[in-house]
């Protein structure tokens, strides 16, 4: 998943739609012209801008990778929202790809959290209740369970 986002200051929208910049900035869904005098609309489904800005171009829409489902399409003011397919998840520290969820917990551990598009199954030790993190265990050491379904 490739994404370019901007985070300028938030601004209150003006009372009316303007085709010229307000205080040097153009509204979400637009970018500024090369002479700085006009606001040009982003192209629906191709690019977008999320904030008031003085960018000379809109940001390219993300295309969902294989292994991802599109939750919402790209509009002129919002980027595409992609989510990992059922049975896979994306970790914060490796956002570039969806990884398969583990099918079960190691022996001596119990599952307390399902597979979601943003987290693997969660396992804790039966006695201590402490979390387990690490690679998926060997198949013969697992207690199988069905993966969770993506949240809508």
């Amino acid at each position: 998943i490739t994404q370019q986002d901007l985070a300028p200051q938030q601004r209150a929208a003006p009372q009316q739609k303007r085709s010229s910049p307000s205080e040097g900035l153009c509204p979400p869904g637009h970018h500024i012209s090369e002479d700085g005098r006009d606001c040009i609309s982003c192209k629906y489904g191709q690019d977008y801008s999320t904030h008031w800005n003085d960018l000379l171009f809109c940001l390219r829409c993300t295309r969902c990778d294989s292994g991802e489902v599109e939750l919402s399409p790209c509009t002129t003011t919002r980027n595409t929202v992609c989510q990992c397919e059922e049975g896979t998840f994306r970790e914060e520290d490796s956002p570039e790809m969806c990884r398969k969820c583990r099918t079960g917990c190691p022996r001596g551990m119990v599952k307390v959290g399902d597979c979601t598009p943003w987290s693997d199954i969660e396992c804790v030790h039966k006695e201590s209740g402490t979390k387990h993190s690490g690679e998926a265990p060997a198949v013969e050491e697992t207690v199988t369970s069905s993966p969770g379904t993506p949240a809508s």
């Epitope: 910049p21 205080e23 012209s33 090369e34 700085g36 904030h51 003085d54 960018l55 000379l56 171009f57």
Partner: antibody, heavy 117, light 110 residues
Framework: QVQLVESGGGLVQPGGSLRLSCSAS????????MIWVRQAPGKGLEYVGF???????YYASWAKGRFTISRDNSKNTLYLQMNSLRAEDTAVYYC???????????WGQGTLVTVSS | DIQMTQSPSSLSASVGDRVTITCRAS??????LSWYQQKPGKAPKRLIY???TLASGVPSRFSGSGSGTDFTLTISSLQPEDAATYYC????????????FGGGTKVEIK
């Protein structure tokens, strides 16, 4: 002749204030965004802030609250008001004409500001 | 803010050499990048804008290329008067992101 001339630099004590002026000739500043850039001795160029043609000012994060950019279109002059000056503000300050797509196309000669006790 | 990473920070080359300076933006700026030349005690001078457009009066031995995040300034045949420090600067989103210059590349003649 199209040019920019800065003035107002000099020696100022820490905590003091200074107002730099940038006088334009050969073109009207009202039609352009204008930018201030500074350069500490032996260092690189550092963006200070800029002002749009409709007089909205934007600043580098470190300059917010201490520095104020304004313009007087009738005098064809750009200003940089600097308050609560620190030793690290010692630099040559340049004003320049900024065009959105074509960059900073016209620069002044710079004025030296020295902050020292 | 956009960060501009310039390399190398300095270089020494002989007259007639081909010199290449690179500038990398922390996020895409399309082709909206300018290059400046600064000689000691002087104001910067714009060399190139829109990544590859030569400014008026600039010798044709200077050229620029790149788009997105990676940009290059090339001096095809270094001349003694090219001894200077060179800076890159993004031109898109100055109010949105600021306009941080690259750290500069000092070019010396061997």
């Amino acid at each position: 002749q199209v040019q920019l001339v800065e003035s107002g630099g000099g020696l100022v004590q820490p905590g003091g204030s200074l107002r730099l002026s940038c006088s334009a000739s050969g073109f009207s500043i009202s039609r352009y965004a204008m930018i201030w850039v500074r350069q500490a001795p032996g260092k690189g160029l550092e963006y200070v802030g800029f002002i749009t043609s409709d007089s909205s000012a934007y600043y580098a994060s470190w300059a917010k609250g201490r520095f104020t950019i304004s313009r007087d279109n009738s005098k064809n002059t750009l200003y940089l008001q600097m308050n609560s000056l620190r030793a690290e503000d010692t630099a040559v300050y340049y004003c320049a004409r900024y065009t959105y797509s074509d960059g900073t196309d016209l620069w002044g000669q710079g004025t030296l500001v020295t902050v020292s006790s | 803010d956009i960060q501009m990473t310039q390399s190398p920070s300095s270089l020494s080359a002989s007259v007639g050499d081909r010199v290449t300076i690179t500038c990398r933006a922390s996020q895409s700026i399309s082709t909206y990048l300018s290059w400046y030349q600064q000689k000691p005690g002087k104001a910067p001078k714009r060399l190139i804008y829109k990544a590859s457009t030569l400014a008026s009066g600039v010798p044709s031995r200077f050229s620029g290329s790149g788009s997105g995040t990676d940009f290059t300034l090339t001096i095809s045949s270094l001349q003694p008067e090219d001894a200077a420090t060179y800076y890159c600067q993004p031109n898109s989103g100055i109010a949105t992101y600021g306009a941080a210059f690259g750290g500069g590349t000092k070019v010396e003649i061997k």
